[in-house]
């Protein structure tokens, strides 16, 4: 093994590491907050967000929220810590490399949300059932 450098005079308690001791770097996520969207009745959509941000904390993941009501459609793109709820929902799919939209119950609107943990993964949001691993046939294919 490589001998470590002389100990640096910084607070290592503030450094997030993975299981191998490597420093955990933050995600790069699309981060346009809430924008009007034309994404509707499609298997997948691009975010059309031109802002890619370095997430503030290494534990944060990329999130996209698609909402449709009587007046408009919006798409929200952000970084968020999966240990904390977002819009009152837990980010169940935070470890996924792709942003697979799942419908959530919200009164007065259609509400889909996804989270993912690869760079700019919330740029491409996927609604198509073929990606949804709650489909038992797909689970069979994956685990065969």
């Amino acid at each position: 093994t490589i001998p470590p450098h002389v100990q640096k005079s910084v607070n290592n308690d503030m450094i997030v590491t993975d299981n191998n001791g490597a420093v955990k770097f933050p995600q790069l996520c699309k981060f346009c907050d809430v924008r009007f969207s034309t994404c509707d009745n499609q298997k997948s959509c691009m975010s059309n967000c031109s802002i890619t941000s370095i997430c503030e904390k290494p534990q944060e993941v990329c999130v996209a929220v698609w909402r449709k009501n009587d007046e408009n459609i919006t798409l929200e793109t952000v970084c968020h810590d999966p240990k904390l709820p977002y819009h009152d929902f837990i980010l169940e799919d935070a470890a996924s490399p792709k942003c697979i939209m799942k419908e959530k119950k919200k009164p007065g609107e259609t509400f889909f949300m996804c989270s993912c943990s690869s760079d700019e993964c919330n740029d491409n949001i996927i609604f198509s059932e073929e990606y949804n691993t709650s489909n038992p046939d797909l689970l069979l294919v994956i685990f065969q």
Partner: nanobody, 116 residues
Framework: EVQLLESGGGLVQPGGSLRLSCAAS???????RMWWVRQAPGKGLEWVS?????????YYADSVKGRFTISRDNSKNTLYLQMNSLRAEDTAVYYC?????????WGQGTLVTVSS
């Protein structure tokens, strides 16, 4: 043996400029995306900027956007950070880093002090 050696820090007045360099060795530099990370005394790491392996995609923390420019010269295995319009809050130790490396194996960093 992976080595990252930062240089170019120093004392500069507010509004001034500095150019940091990082000489890399012991790994295939042109295959790796590279980061500039800083740590102010008693604070956590702040992710300043990242550049992809080819050097054609760059990203910045909001706090430095429009003032700092990351670049790299793959023929020299060197990473750069051009820092303009420096502010007191930019005072920190600046490290260059690559993915997958424990903090103890990072370089010593280079201290940037912005003060009048």
């Amino acid at each position: 043996e992976v080595q990252l050696l930062e240089s170019g820090g120093g004392l500069v007045q507010p509004g001034g400029s500095l150019r940091l360099s990082c000489a890399a060795s012991g790994f295939t530099f042109n295959d790796m995306r590279m980061w500039w990370v800083r740590q102010a005394p008693g604070k956590g790491l702040e992710w300043v900027s990242v550049i992809n392996a080819d050097g054609n995609r760059t990203y910045y923390a909001d706090s430095v956007k429009g003032r700092f420019t990351i670049s790299r010269d793959n023929s020299k295995n060197t990473l750069y950070l051009q820092m303009n319009s420096l502010r007191a809050e930019d005072t920190a130790v600046y490290y260059c880093a690559k993915d997958g490396l424990p903090f103890d194996y990072w370089g010593q960093g280079t201290l940037v002090t912005v003060s009048s």
